[in-house]
């Protein structure tokens, strides 16, 4: 007895598609061995039509695929554009065709529905609209028009021209009589239900001279599209429900046990807590289509998803729907990276972002997920030298360590930086990942002065105190700019006296600026790293002013508590464009970033002269890029 299992019989009609699932014991050997689909010949052989090793017969070219789902112990054969020639006996199996590890499947493809016995066949998707056309002769132009549904042996009145509507159709049916020139009436049924399927009879007149027309209504439940994505990766559901529901609330739900379909997200503002921080519902187009992006895929995200339209923002009978079966591949190509990164207020975080290593030249982005309305993710920084104005001096995207990972450093952390951030590129959209930054209590490890003023033409020395826990790390100073942080020479001044209970391994490392010029004004970071992996950083803003008295400046930690410079921005401040990922397609087909003016970007985008508590130091008070 073969351990392979599947459908013994598959019945379909010409033009349709089938998805045949074959089940196998998910042992390590079985998971990785060849999977095949073959057609049994009259003489007992079995000719391979498609296999998991890439072979596709010319008979199946462009209309079939075979997908293995190793963690489920299944593989699926999809065959489209069926014809009666596809009818026959097949095997799905593992290993070699003749070995016997297989299951017999009978596929029967019958002729598609047509005009049989003067019956017009209407094939319509669940939730959509059908128009049943009913011709009549001149002598019945003034007589009663009606539509009946055959229930068992009896016709039941559905609607008529005198105003009757069967209660099962209330609010979703109408009878239209065309202008006098056309001898035709139509019955339009909206929000089609599966129970609407069946035989209908339309009639003009009630006597023996009445005109009758038969109609066969077939209501199709959408076939779930199989979607196979990697653990920790991203999925996009594109939902096109048609222009007739363009103004109706949209939803994406996930089928749980029973008839429940739990709302994942909808356009009425509902969002399931499990998807907080990792979902965007893209604003819909004029034609009613929309898309939903989910990042940071988890094992438990697997399942059947439905998108639809209904005024309640959730699945109801008669909702037009589209369906997907999402499988989450645990043998993921996307490496593990922390989903939560904790940082101390006033200190920093270094986030590692994975990307497809085949796309090393792609543009890298980092954005902040915002939950308002349907979710959006305004860009904060990219790898081409753009940084959102409010983050100048405290945010940097580095291509290091490379080979499939880039680094984002955010310092001068405040409680307002807590939230969800997305790593993404303009390449492979499946590689969008999510990280949550949590702000915790504590003291920054690195100690630097809070506010430094240098004098033109003089020498400035800025200290950075490293505790002994960083004794094995490389210590550096760098000057921040939009494209990164350029390393500067620094001097090790020996052990630091800034730490209690810290031995000789603590270090004071100074940055020296000789003959200060206007160009030296800006943000400077001191930090630690190990090879290409970055650790904590601390930021200092150096302002440059005219000479008042001769001499050099040596800044000590005593000045670290000085109040932030309260200089208000001059009116010539250049407004930088706010870039927001509002349309996930921009990272799929168009490979571009949406630029929208920074008008109503909320509190983060507002340029104020608020306290250092709000935005982390004085990063917003010194815009030196006029």
């Amino acid at each position: 007895k073969s351990p392979i299992f599947g459908p013994e019989e598959v019945n379909s009609v010409e033009g349709n598609s089938v998805s045949i699932t074959c089940y196998y014991p998910p042992t390590s050997v079985n998971r990785h061995t060849r999977k095949y689909w073959c057609r049994q010949g009259a003489r007992g052989g079995c000719i391979t039509l498609i296999s998991s090793e890439g072979y596709v017969s010319s008979k199946y070219a462009g209309r079939a695929n075979l997908t293995n789902f190793p963690e489920n112990g299944t593989f699926v054969v999809n065959i489209a554009q069926l014809s009666q020639d596809d009818s026959g006996r097949y095997k799905c199996g593992l290993g070699i065709n003749s070995r016997g590890l297989s299951f017999d499947v009978s596929l029967e493809v019958s002729q598609g529905p047509g005009l049989l016995n003067d019956t017009k066949v209407y094939t319509v998707d669940l939730g959509r609209t059908v128009t049943i056309n009913c011709p009549f002769k001149t002598e019945n132009a003034q007589k009663r028009k009606s539509l009946y549904k055959q229930i068992g042996l009896y016709p039941v009145l559905v609607i008529d021209s005198s105003g009757y509507v069967n209660p099962n159709y209330t609010g979703r049916i109408r009878l239209d009589i065309q202008g006098t020139g056309q001898l035709l009436f139509s019955v339009v049924i909206n929000q089609l239900r599966l129970s609407d399927a069946g035989q209908y009879l339309c009639q003009a007149g009630d006597d023996s001279n009445s005109n009758k027309k038969n109609a066969d209504l077939q209501v199709l439940k959408p076939e779930p599209e199989l979607v196979y994505e990697d653990l920790r990766g991203s999925v996009t559901f594109h939902c096109a429900l048609g222009p007739e529901v363009a103004n109706v609330a949209k939803f994406l739900c996930r089928q749980s046990s029973g008839e429940n379909c739990d709302v994942v997200v909808n356009t009425l503002g509902k969002r399931a807590p499990a998807f907080e921080g990792r979902i965007l519902l893209n604003p819909q187009d004029k034609d009613g289509s929309f898309s939903v992006v989910i990042t940071g895929l988890r094992k438990e995200d697997a399942g059947r998803y439905l998108c639809g339209a209904h005024s309640d923002g959730q699945l109801q009978e008669g909702s037009p729907i589209q369906a997907w079966q999402l499988f989450v591949n645990e043998e993921s190509t996307i490496p593990r990276s922390p989903t939560v990164v904790k940082g101390v207020a006033g200190s920093s975080v270094a986030v590692l972002c994975p990307y497809n290593r085949k796309e090393s030249k792609s543009i890298k982005y980092w954005c902040l997920w915002e939950g308002a309305q349907n979710g959006r993710c305004p860009l904060l920084v990219d790898s081409e030298g753009w940084v959102k104005a409010q983050y100048e001096g405290r945010l940097s995207l580095l291509e290091e360590p490379g080979n499939g990972t880039f680094t984002v450093i955010l310092n001068q952390l405040t409680s307002r930086d807590a939230g969800f951030y997305w790593c993404l590129t303009n390449g492979d959209t499946l590689w969008r990942t999510t990280v949550e930054i949590k702000i915790i209590e504590g003291e920054p490890n690195l100690k630097v002065p809070g506010n430094v003023t240098a004098v033109l033409g003089e020498t400035l020395k800025v200290p950075c105190h490293f505790p002994c826990k960083f004794s094995s790390y490389e210590k550096y100073w760098c000057k921040w700019n939009n494209t990164g942080c350029q390393a500067l020479p620094s001097q090790d001044e020996g052990p630091s006296k800034a730490f209690v209970n810290c031995d000789e391994n603590s270090r004071l490392v100074s940055l020296t600026l000789n003959l200060v010029t206007r160009a030296d004004e800006g943000w400077y970071w001191c930090g630690v790293k190990q090879g290409h992996f970055y650790g904590e950083t601390a930021a200092v803003y150096v302002a440059v002013e005219e000479r008042k008295a001769a001499g050099s400046r040596d800044v000590s930690l005593a000045k670290a508590d000085a109040a932030p410079d309260e200089k208000v921005l001059d009116s010539g401040f250049r407004e930088i464009e706010n870039k927001a990922i509002q349309d996930p397609r921009l990272f799929a087909e168009e490979k571009a970033v949406a630029d929208t003016r920074d008008q109503a970007d909320g509190s983060r985008a507002s340029v104020d002269s608020g306290s250092s508590e709000e935005q982390g130091g004085s990063s917003r008070h010194h815009h030196h890029h006029h």
Epitope: Y23, S195, K221
Partner: nanobody
């Protein structure tokens, strides 16, 4: 909710035939598959046959012991699934349960079915 009502069970001789019916009512628009399970005296409930559908395509699954003897079918308009049982054997004696599922990843697994009928007794005497 979806309600399932089985009918058609009874007492027959070995080699005879029976046709079981399962009528579904309620929110049947969410179901994707219906099947038959059976529980013989002192035995676990076991998979017999399932039919799943998508549009005008049907997929029929059977357990080995009934292949060639039992046929599962459905009437979409009546929301009813049938199990035609031919060449019945004494070992087919059991309570036959109808089940419906909204999300079916493996038709053989009991826990993938969300709704169950009360069952109908089939007794095959030798």
């Amino acid at each position: 909710q979806v309600q399932l009502v089985e009918s058609g069970g009874g007492l027959v001789q070995a080699g005879d035939s029976l046709r079981l019916s399962c009528a579904a009512s309620g929110r049947t628009f969410t179901t994707y598959g219906m099947g038959w399970f059976r529980q013989g005296p002192g035995k676990e409930r076991e998979f017999v046959a399932t039919i799943t559908w998508s549009g005008s395509t049907n997929y029929k699954y059977y357990t080995d012991s009934v292949k060639g003897r039992f046929t599962i079918s459905r009437d979409n308009a009546k929301n009813t699934v049938y199990l035609q049982m031919n060449s019945l054997k004494p070992e087919d004696t059991a309570v036959y349960y109808c089940a419906a599922s909204t999300v079916l990843t493996d038709p053989r697994r009991l826990n993938e079915y969300d709704y169950w009928g009360q069952g109908t007794q089939v007794t095959v005497s030798s």
